[in-house]
């Protein structure tokens, strides 16, 4: 099943002490999915979307960006036929830099 979209969302961090907010969105035909946020292959957080929403926002406490492990990825899972869990491909990576550029 298709990979989710991942994006850093406001309020953007201006230093390593600020919290990080990362949204992960599945295609619209997968509402209510379970989402996992990874950093360097390690699970950071798990969240389930409400049944009428296609994504979640992971809120990471200040200092999260100091931990080693590289970029963030996310993935979602849905129940397929025979109640078997199907996992999406991994999202593209998102890197956190300071300050985050705005147009």
């Amino acid at each position: 099943i298709p990979a989710p979209s991942i994006r850093l969302v406001p309020p953007y961090p201006s230093s390593q002490e600020d919290p990080i907010h990362i949204a992960c969105m599945a295609p619209g035909n997968f509402p209510g999915a379970n989402f996992t946020l990874y950093r360097g292959g390690q699970v950071v957080q798990l969240l389930q979307a409400p049944t009428d929403q296609r994504g979640v926002t992971f809120n990471l406490s200040g200092g999260s960006s100091k931990a080693p492990g590289g970029p963030f990825h996310c993935q979602y899972g849905v129940l397929g036929e025979l109640n078997q869990s199907q996992l999406s491909d991994l999202s593209e990576p998102v890197n956190v830099s300071f300050p985050v550029p705005t147009w």
Partner: antibody, heavy 122, light 107 residues
């Protein structure tokens, strides 16, 4: 079927105020961010404003900031746009638009209402 | 603000034709792009989101692709109801911005 029905448009004199309403049905309104988008006669589409699902976050286009206020009443499944100091450049069809299955602006937009026409003229 | 440009601004085609429209963003918008269809006097209808995903119920003859700054929208086997104006729109950042539209009319 998801429906958005806008009302409140009409002919108004420059400098006056108007309030548009949009009633939502057949979806959980309180779980979705909502937008207003306008289209002047024969022109392209212009995003106007957005409000998050709980009403805590509101953002505006530069052209309306300080004059327009977006608000919502989740108990009435209704979105509002209060428009003050209207000018001829605000003449347009105003569309109410649902966020694409999400509580904030960054989910994009999916379902549109049929629009309500605002004409600003003396 | 992110500027969106579309080409062509209009085109003439016949039923059964294949039509391709391009959209360009002034900054990288990754895949945060919608395509809409609008008939005269009607509201826009979402066809494609996240650059390439078809909205539920949209016929498979409509497709989209691209990422970053360059995007395409294709209609295969053009049908009578497809004669309309098509808009791209970015939602990478606020304010959301739309392309100027491409009017597809009958040759």
């Amino acid at each position: 079927e998801v429906q958005l029905v806008e009302t409140g448009g009409g002919l108004i004199q420059p400098g006056r105020s108007l309030r548009l309403s949009c009633v939502a049905s057949d979806f959980r309104f309180s779980n979705h961010a909502m937008h207003w988008v306008r289209q002047a006669p024969g022109k392209e589409l212009e995003w106007v404003a957005v409000i998050s699902s709980d009403g805590s976050n509101r953002q505006y286009a530069y052209s309306v900031k300080g004059r327009f206020t977006i608000s919502r009443d989740n108990s009435k499944n209704t979105l509002y746009l209060e428009m003050n100091i209207l000018g001829p450049e605000d003449t347009a069809v105003y569309f109410c638009v649902r966020s694409h299955l999400g509580p904030e602006w960054y989910y994009g937009m999916d379902v549109w209402g049929q629009g309500t026409t605002v004409t600003v003229s003396s | 603000d992110i500027q969106m440009t579309q080409s062509p601004s209009s085109l003439s085609a016949s039923v059964g034709d294949r039509v391709t429209i391009t959209c360009q963003a002034s900054h990288d918008i990754r895949k945060f792009l919608n395509w809409y269809q609008q008939h005269p006097g009607k509201a826009p209808k979402l066809l494609i989101y996240d650059a390439a995903y078809s909205e539920i119920g949209v016929p498979s003859r409509f497709s989209g692709g691209g990422s970053g700054t360059d995007f395409t929208f294709t209609i295969n086997n053009l049908q009578p109801d497809d004669f309309a104006t098509y808009y791209c729109q970015q939602y990478e950042s606020l304010p959301f911005t739309f392309g100027p539209g491409t009017k597809v009319d009958i040759k």
